[in-house]
Interface confidence: medium
């Protein structure tokens, strides 16, 4: 029988009455156009909703927008359009919400064609009040807040000027012209690329990368012949044109661009691309596109310097630059990532890694599922997850995979069970152990969200027909209750809950359609009375993450340590609460060779865990030599995997070899620039 309909599913008592008392409807006095919603601050309950409606007239487009504010998690809304002088707000810029709990909001207004500059509305009190400010430029991008100081804003203008404000958008100063891309780094540093001659597009590969650490008073050139740059974790990456041809290579810096080393990655040609899939302070996942229009490439994982890379996964699906990849960081369990590969027969398969890219495997077949028509052997198949690529292909997949750091071990995703991803209507699957095992949770496609750190999962069926029913589970998706939240079904457009999955409120957004008009409507349901009491110690149980063999002393060891978590028992119906903190107990593991990667100049022969020295470095390998400070050029053959905390056990010490004797780098130094003008 379908999940949730078994005899042993206990029902939550009196839930209909409890939810009915906590269901709040708000009908918006708007013609249906588009709606965008933003949360302002953390645990403040403040939501801003911007509705916009376009009427295409013969000569121009007439636009109208309205701004609404809630301070009770969406239960009630107040029309505050008058605070922004009934101005039409540009939705493509969204609502620029300040970092942390700064309470800052910037809205960018539509202005008439002949105006000198744009217009913004600024609030620093969680949208209670707004100040109108006319800009000395027309913005090309949304205002970007410095992560360190929410008073510092930067924006690019339509004329490629880089503008900075030091007083939360009150006064603006153009600190540089001819800027292509600008990003905040740490400590209020700004990195940007600039062109000398034609334009960003024309000068691609001949850009310079500059840095300012004092908001434009002084500058430092940190890169030349730049194609693009990116920031990830503590790493700064630049893709740099090679001297002799049209290929480019990745260079990496860990000191904000003062010194650079060439990453040990293949170079790419004009039609190829690099992409930082994920980065933290320890390491980087880098995708390198294959030559030709293959739609796939290779994932490499870095060492702690971002310089030496190990091949992690072949035939990784990634369509084009800025295209689609299914690469997903499973945030509910350390070291877990899911992505898709394009197999030789052009079918798409899901792969999962539990050790930060060290090994990839197929997802285990859910026990309560049959293999579908894609399976050659009906008894042996895997779960395949639908993510961004499936959504881009307009398959019946309303949502990407979902995991939350404070809902330990829980992963929810659409999928199919077979030898590859199926184009048939998918079902929803859940894992409660970070992706090791899976269970079918719901039949058919659904929208889903996690509330109260995993204490409640909410779902709504994906349907083209109007809906009025929401499903919820208090036991990590084993059993489901249904609640009719309105008599009059609505055309559903989205679920909204406060980011961070700590809230117990869910908002259901949609519109009603009558003969003459259609209106936006939201229903906010508070589940606080379903979880009547606060969780106590007895409601939690100890769980060892990454456990695959309880008999083994090293069971659960991933990246040199294991972690035991206190997790809510599935049978406990109680509130984790907004202040819930994940309780975990780490313990260090003994080192094995698996805790080390091979350093530059060394490799692992097939089925061998030892790193052996490459017989000689010649030909193509010359390009992989390290460049920069002296310590980059010494190695003992092994290097601890980034973030690995193992101690004792195997300690692979080697004599230090000076690789300078073996090769020279072709890292682009200014001496090697062409003397011809670009």
């Amino acid at each position: 029988s379908a999940p949730g309909e078994d005899e042993e599913c206990g029902r939550v008592r009196d839930f209909v009455a409890k939810l009915a008392n906590n269901t709040h409807q708000h009908v918006f006095d708007d013609l249906r156009g588009s709606v965008s919603l933003s949360w302002v601050g953390d645990s403040t309950g403040v939501i801003l909703v911007l509705t916009t409606f376009h009427v295409p007239l013969v000569i121009m487009t007439f636009g109208q927008s309205k701004l609404y504010r809630s301070e009770d998690y969406g239960k009630n809304f107040k029309d505050i359009t008058d605070l922004i002088n009934n101005t039409f707000i540009r939705t493509e810029f969204g609502m620029a919400i300040g970092p942390e709990n700064s309470g800052k909001v910037v809205l960018t207004a539509e202005v008439s064609g002949g105006s000198r500059g744009g217009r913004i509305f600024r609030s620093s009190d969680f949208a209670k009040n707004f100040v109108q400010t006319d800009l000395p430029f027309h913005p090309l991008t949304q205002m970007m807040y410095s992560p360190q100081n929410s008073d510092y804003l930067l924006a690019l203008s339509t004329e490629n000027g880089l503008w900075v404000s030091k007083n939360f958008g009150g006064k603006w100063e153009e600190i540089h012209k001819a800027v292509c891309l600008a990003k905040w780094g740490s400590d209020n540093t700004i990195f940007f690329t600039t062109y000398a001659n034609g334009s960003c597009k024309a000068d691609l590969g001949a850009l310079e990368l500059w840095r300012t650490s004092d908001l434009g008073k002084s500058f430092k050139t940190i890169g030349v012949k730049i194609y693009s740059f990116g920031l990830g974790g503590r790493f700064l990456f630049a893709s740099v044109m090679a001297d002799k041809d049209t290929t480019r290579r990745i260079h990496v810096s860990t000191d904000q661009g003062d010194t650079w080393s060439m990453a040990q990655l293949p170079s790419v040609g004009q039609e190829q691309f690099y992409s930082i899939l994920a980065a933290n302070d320890d390491m980087v996942f880098m995708h390198v596109d294959e030559p030709g229009d293959t739609g796939f490439g290779t994932i490499f994982t870095s060492d702690d310097r971002g310089i030496v890379y190990s091949k992690s996964l072949d035939r990784h699906l990634y369509t084009t630059t800025g295209g689609e990849t299914d690469f997903t960081n499973v945030t509910s369990l350390r070291g877990v990532y899911i992505t898709s590969v394009l197999s030789e027969d052009n079918s798409i398969q899901t792969m999962i890694t539990f050790d930060q890219g060290g090994r990839w495997t197929h997802l285990r077949k859910p026990e309560n599922s049959e293999c579908d028509a894609t399976a050659k052997n009906k008894n042996e198949c895997s779960l395949h997850i639908h993510a961004s690529y499936s959504i881009s292909q307009k398959l019946n997949v309303p949502m990407a995979p979902l995991s939350e750091p404070n809902a330990v071990g829980i992963v929810i995703a659409h999928g199919s069970v077979g030898d590859a991803i199926s184009v048939m209507v998918p079902d929803v699957y859940i894992s409660d152990d970070g992706g090791y095992s899976w269970t079918k949770m719901l039949e058919g496609p659904h929208y889903y969200t996690i509330l109260d750190s995993g204490g409640i999962i909410v779902a709504i069926e994906h349907s083209s027909r109007p809906i009025n029913v929401i499903k919820f589970s208090t036991d990590e998706g084993q059993c489901w209750q249904t609640y009719t939240f309105t008599r009059d079904p609505i055309y559903f457009t989205g679920l909204a809950s406060e980011p961070g999955a700590r809230s117990m409120n869910i908002s259901i957004w949609g519109f009603t359609e009558s003969f003459l008009t259609s209106q936006w409507v939201s229903y906010t349901i508070d589940f606080k009375d379903i979880l009547e009491r606060n969780c106590e110690e007895k409601d939690y149980t100890i769980w060892l993450a990454h456990s695959t063999d309880p008999e083994d002393y090293e069971d659960g060891c991933i990246l040199g340590y294991k972690e035991q978590f206190l997790r809510l028992r599935k049978s406990s119906v109680c509130q984790n609460g907004r202040d819930y903190v994940v309780t975990k107990q780490p313990s260090i593991c003994l080192c094995s060779l698996e805790d080390f990667l091979c350093d530059f100049g060394y490799y692992r022969p097939e089925n061998d865990s030892k790193c052996v020295e490459q017989p000689e470095l010649k030909g193509h390998d010359l390009e992989f030599c390290l460049y920069g400070r002296e310590e980059h050029l010494t190695t003992n053959g092994y290097r601890k995997i980034p973030g690995d905390k193992c101690q004792g056990g195997v300690n692979p010490v080697r004599e230090v070899k000076d690789l300078k004797k073996k090769c020279t780098s072709n890292f682009l130094s200014p001496e090697k620039q062409n003397s011809k003008s670009n």
Epitope: T194, A196, N197, A206, E208, T212, S213, S218, F219, K220, T221, I222, G223, V224, G257, D258, T259, W260, G628, S669, P670, E671, K672, Q673, N674, S675, K676, S677, N678
Partner: antibody, heavy 124, light 107 residues
């Protein structure tokens, strides 16, 4: 040998413009930044800006922004510095100086080769 | 802008003396500091780059030290041809800035 040869002395009226040239020889012109530094009579050294002759990128000191233009002609290995709207306090010796190249990407390991200097006098 | 403060602004010394000139930056400039010598009517000449590296062709009696904000130029044994004005210069960031100069005169 490596040398920078600058154009001759100039006398200009206030409000006029001056264009000083600096011809490089003995090295690859495009591979080194060219800086311009001036020195008023009896005063210290004042940096005006640089040009990367390879790409044409320039960077000017804020004080001269809007008045100075640095250009180059790679075909004849020559850098130019033009200063407009001259005032009497622009009277100085103007030097071009080659940026000593590091093995990294910086403006700065000093200026290792200097031109002989061009005296510009601004007087009504 | 980064201010470079040189001291002393002038000093008198004899041939054979050990001479020390200091330069302080208003903020850290790592080791991006260079020293120049200038004689009347001549262009400056690079002596030390990157705080302590001796430019080729410069006598070994010149040495530089320091990093961050405090730097020193030392002439171990002053020679007749060393009487000149010395400038420090930071090249960490643009705008590049020079110290006010130290004039070394014959005692």
């Amino acid at each position: 040998q490596v040398q920078l040869v600058q154009s001759g002395a100039e006398v200009k009226k206030p409000g006029a413009s001056v264009k000083v040239s600096c011809k490089a020889s003995g090295y690859t012109f495009g591979a080194y930044y060219m800086h311009w530094v001036r020195q008023a009579p009896g005063q210290g050294l004042e940096w005006m800006g640089w040009i990367n002759p390879n790409s044409g990128f320039t960077r000017y000191a804020q004080k001269f922004q809007g008045r100075v233009t640095m250009t180059r002609d790679t075909s004849i290995s020559t850098a130019y510095m033009e200063l407009s709207r001259l005032r009497s306090d622009d009277t100085a010796v103007y030097y071009c100086a080659r940026g000593k190249r590091s093995s990294g990407w910086y403006e700065g390991y000093g200026m290792d080769v200097w031109g002989q200097g061009t005296t510009v006098t601004v007087s009504s | 802008d980064i201010q470079m403060t040189q001291s002393p602004s002038s000093l008198s010394a004899s041939v054979g003396d050990r001479v020390t000139i200091t330069c302080r930056a208003s903020q850290s400039i790592s080791s991006y500091l260079n020293w120049y010598q200038q004689k009347p009517g001549k262009a400056p000449k690079l002596l030390i780059y990157a705080a302590s590296s001796l430019q080729s062709g410069v006598p070994s009696r010149f040495s530089g030290s320091g990093s961050g904000t405090d730097f020193t130029l030392t002439i171990s044994s002053l020679q007749p041809e060393d009487f000149a004005t010395y400038y420090c210069q930071q090249s960490d960031v643009s705008p590049i800035t020079f110290g006010g100069g130290t004039k070394v005169e014959i005692k």
